[in-house]
Interface confidence: medium
């Protein structure tokens, strides 16, 4: 048999070997594909199958627009002018080339010695699924599960049957000061089909120096608030990846989900006290902010409380 690959949506003509080029012809086409339950014999006279597959005057079989359901086996049996039976056998596979793959959510920079998500490579609309590969400085990157981690996901569109592939790359760069270039390529795995490449991204690797100072910003300034008001405490820390932030009041950890912002709505006297935040960074352990005092008073004009943050007010977090 002969293997045939056809692009989805395009016509495909399969010739019936040995068949006379014009009637009278003795021939029979039968097919076993995703459209048929078992072998289906096509009539040269035509019929309801004409829109899907029809026999041409020269005995060839025409599929006007191949689809995934046309994958399968096609056989023709013909009797030539000398009365000898000739058989043709085709194994048809279809393919669809996806759009150019893209790296989405790319990192802006990498930090040495810690896991960094480089980005997610996405390819949409392929058939068969194909594969995504990552390249570092032009060389194929082999995931080792430690310094190089790849998380893959393949989804099939329920209506079109085409595939969307996602591949998320995480790396642990060994040293800072380098500028690696990452790219991703999609391959269908078909002969004579070149891989499709993303645009490369070049990233700077920096050393994971200790996080710069941790700052606790309070709004309203001075930490003095009237009953029923709202206090916003913001733990500002410039570190990558962003650390987990926990909160402490009067020396005891507060029972909160990690968050860089602590909101105290509708404050009452029970909220008075000394607050600080603790940022836990994977490679540097916990770092505690200087404390701020919160005071609840009927008149908010007593000036900054001792130990509170004065000038800074509420900054913005990236």
């Amino acid at each position: 048999g002969q293997n045939i690959t056809a692009r989805i949506g395009e016509p495909l003509v399969l010739s019936c070997k040995g068949a006379p080029k014009k009637p009278p012809q003795q021939l029979e086409w039968k097919l076993n594909t995703g459209r048929t339950e078992a072998w289906k014999v096509l009539s040269p006279q035509g019929g309801p199958w004409d829109s899907v597959a029809r026999i041409l005057p020269n005995g060839s079989l025409l599929l006007p627009a191949t689809g995934i359901v046309d994958e399968g086996t096609f056989r023709c049996r013909a009797t030539n002018r000398r009365g000898k039976e000739v058989k043709s056998n085709y194994r048809v596979r279809v393919y669809q080339i996806p759009g150019k793959p893209e790296i989405v959510d790319p990192a802006s920079e990498l930090t040495a010695s810690v896991p960094n998500k480089v980005g997610t490579c996405v390819s949409e609309g392929s058939y068969p699924a194909g594969t995504l590969s990552w390249h570092l400085d032009g060389k194929l990157l082999i995931p080792d599960g430690k310094e190089t981690l790849v998380k893959e996901e393949t989804r099939r569109h329920p209506e079109t049957g085409l595939f969307t592939l996602r591949s998320e790359l995480t790396v642990i760069p060994t040293q800072g000061g380098t500028h690696p270039t990452f790219s991703c390529s999609f391959s269908l795995g078909l002969p004579r089909r070149r891989p499709l490449n993303t645009a490369p991204i070049q990233l700077r690797v920096r050393e994971p120096g200790p996080p710069e100072g941790i700052q606790l910003l309070v709004e309203p300034e001075g930490g003095i608030v009237a009953p029923g008001g709202t206090v916003t405490l913001t733990c500002a820390i410039s570190a990558q990846p962003p650390p987990q932030v926990h909160w402490i009041k009067d020396g005891a950890p507060l029972p909160l989900a990690p968050s860089p912002v602590l909101l105290l709505p509708e404050v009452g006297h029970e909220d008075e006290g000394t607050y600080s935040c603790v940022a836990t960074h994977p490679s540097h352990g916990p770092q505690e902010s200087p404390p701020v005092s919160i005071r609840v008073t009927e008149t908010g004009d007593e000036g900054p409380a001792e130990g509170s943050v004065g000038e800074s007010g509420l900054g913005t977090l990236a």
Epitope: T230, A252, P253, L254, P255, L256, A257, P258, S259, P260, V261, L262, L263, L264, P265, E266, E270, D271
Partner: antibody
Amino acid sequence: QVQLQQSGAELVRPGTSVKVSCKASGYAFTNYLIDWVNQRPGQGLEWIGVINPGSGGTNYNEKFTGKATLTADKSSSTAYMQLSSLTSDDSAVYFCARRRVDTMDYWGQGTSVTVSS
Amino acid sequence: QAVVTQESALTTSPGETVTLTCRSSTGAVTTSNYANWVQEKPDHLFTGLIGGTNNRAPGVPARFSGSLIGDKAALTITGAQTEDEAIYFCALWYSNHWVFGGGTKLTVL
């Protein structure tokens, strides 16, 4: 007034997942935490986890790590809890509760989840 | 995991003062356990009463108060009323999770 409106009762098959919702109204959704708690038939209360709708930060009871996933949609003021790989042990009434730092004040009416084949 | 223990049932009369307690298997209950008290009425109707050991939740009547008594957290109802008949749960915070007690069934006769 403050209200936490939970989604209706669910009857689900073992091995599947279920997503329970908790729609908040009457207050600023991102200013308070949302805790999730369950009550198995004839038993006490068990804390599942908490989400900070403002930041998306979560904290789980170790027992429910991998079983429960907490999310929140600020635009609709709704908190969600997804439970996966359900077994009959997961049959319970699930509650959401608003928390202001250290005080669980308002509770939802509960969502009954029954896992049965 | 810590175990939190409450009286299984208590009975009081209208107008009386009643105290429910909450004990921790890990030692004395402190303010760092942020004791919460929650009331359950029929049909899974839960209401938070007290948080942070002694902070009353909004709209909770002043007859409910929270405190630490000895090595336990306590909920005191001063002048109990018939509508206070319910199950009361306490919850204690242990550094990264809450643990609830088994509940106290309070009958007001």
